[in-house]
């Protein structure tokens, strides 16, 4: 014997008190899939949590964290604070890149200065904590007299700046 | 920098009512809900409910529904947690945390005596 | 509601000891797991939230790990410091739960 539930397709809840007929899910809640016999609370971004997906008959909320901090956890569970450009998230919180590398976003890690010289290139701007280096022509592409940029002592490996 | 400062120590009787203040500075407060947990004295910490600063939304704890009641007034970025019908297992130090799925600042604590 | 399950309850312990405390949930809380310390004066602090991430401030002595219901709190190299209470908390759904909390004392 086929069980009569189901037939009950998502968005709606196969209702015992009504003799199994299917039924809509109440307002906010949801099934997002069928033959279910109860429908589940809608989640509610609320505080540091945004809404960034209403919650519909068939799909629950999704949130998402207000400007200044960014999602962990499946389905933004948390929210944790962005750090400023220059800098990287550590296990001991937002830290300064080490010098030779350089973070240009608000999340992500510090990642190293481009090595002009492997392209055969020399340093047009230096690097800073925020920007990556800009590499210019080749040294012999240089006309006679012309200076390049110094180009930056040799990267130390990330995570072993002077404390 | 970040701060949560709650309202002083309170000896009531039983059957008696508590409110609980909890003024937030250094951050908008109307931007992170603001839970209350409580310990009783040699116990765990209970959760009791949160408040939702901007819309004042609650969720409250099951247990405590019937009796809690969590307020704001954005005005002066402060959270209110009433306790009614106060028993003497309601002796208990009640702290107010700010939440970002986890509870980054808490403040002192408050100190409820119940005694007859 | 999902029930945080603490060991042990109580750890006597020497300066430099390595310590580890663990926390059971009832149920797949998907890492979403904090640490707390209280010190004797009854301040709260936050530790690690999701499972490892040190909150700031935090000495990297501490560190957090697990998954789905099974989590530890360790101390690489215990501080005088470091005698407190410690708490783990599910933030999974609601309500929010706390373990029974682990008191480390100077052994």
């Known amino acids: 014997l086929q069980d009569p539930c189901s037939n009950c397709p998502a968005g709606t809840f196969c209702d015992n008190n009504r003799n199994q007929i299917c039924s809509p899910c109440p307002p906010n809640s949801f099934s997002s899939a069928g033959g279910q016999r109860t429908c589940d609370i809608c989640r509610q971004c609320k505080g540091v949590f945004r809404t960034r997906k209403e919650c519909s008959s068939t799909s629950n909320a999704e949130c998402d964290c207000t400007p200044g901090f960014h999602c962990l956890g499946a389905g933004c569970s948390m929210c944790e604070q962005d750090c400023k450009q220059g800098q990287e998230l550590t296990k001991k919180g937002c830290k300064d890149c080490c010098f030779g590398t350089f973070n240009d976003q608000k999340r992500g890690i510090c990642r190293p200065w481009t090595n002009c010289s492997l392209d055969g290139k020399s340093v047009l701007v230096n690097g800073t904590k925020e920007r990556d280096v800009v590499c210019g022509p080749s040294p012999a592409d240089l006309s006679p007299g012309a200076s390049s940029v110094t180009p930056p002592a040799p990267a130390r490996e990330p995570g072993h700046s002077p404390q | 920098q970040v701060q949560l400062v709650q309202s002083g120590a309170e000896v009531k009787k039983p059957g008696a009512s508590v409110k609980v203040s909890c003024k937030a500075s250094?951050?908008?407060?109307?931007?992170?809900?603001m839970h209350w947990v409580r310990q009783a004295p040699g116990q765990g910490l209970e959760w009791m409910g949160a408040i939702d600063p901007k819309t004042g939304g609650t969720d409250y704890n099951q247990k405590f529904k019937d009796r809690v009641t969590m307020t704001r007034d954005t005005s002066i970025s402060t959270a209110y947690m009433e306790l009614s019908r106060l028993r003497s297992d309601d002796t208990a130090v009640y702290y107010c945390a700010r939440d970002l799925g986890y509870f980054d600042v808490w403040g002192q604590g408050t100190l409820v005596t119940v005694s007859s | 509601d999902i029930q945080m399950t603490q060991s042990p309850s109580s750890l006597s312990a020497s300066v430099g000891d390595r310590v580890t405390i663990t926390c059971r949930a009832s149920?797949?809380?998907?890492?979403?797991l904090n640490w707390y310390q209280q010190k004797p004066g009854g301040a709260v602090k936050l530790l690690i939230y999701y499972t490892s991430r040190l909150h700031s401030g935090v000495p990297s002595r501490f560190s957090g790990s697990g998954s789905g219901t099974d989590y530890t709190l360790t101390i690489s190299s215990l501080q005088p410091e470091d005698f407190a209470t410690y708490f783990c908390q599910q933030s999974e759904k609601l309500p929010r739960t706390f373990g029974g909390g682990t008191k480390l004392e100077i052994r």
């Open positions: 250094g951050y908008t407060f109307a931007g992170f809900e």
């Open positions: 149920q797949d809380i998907r890492s979403n």
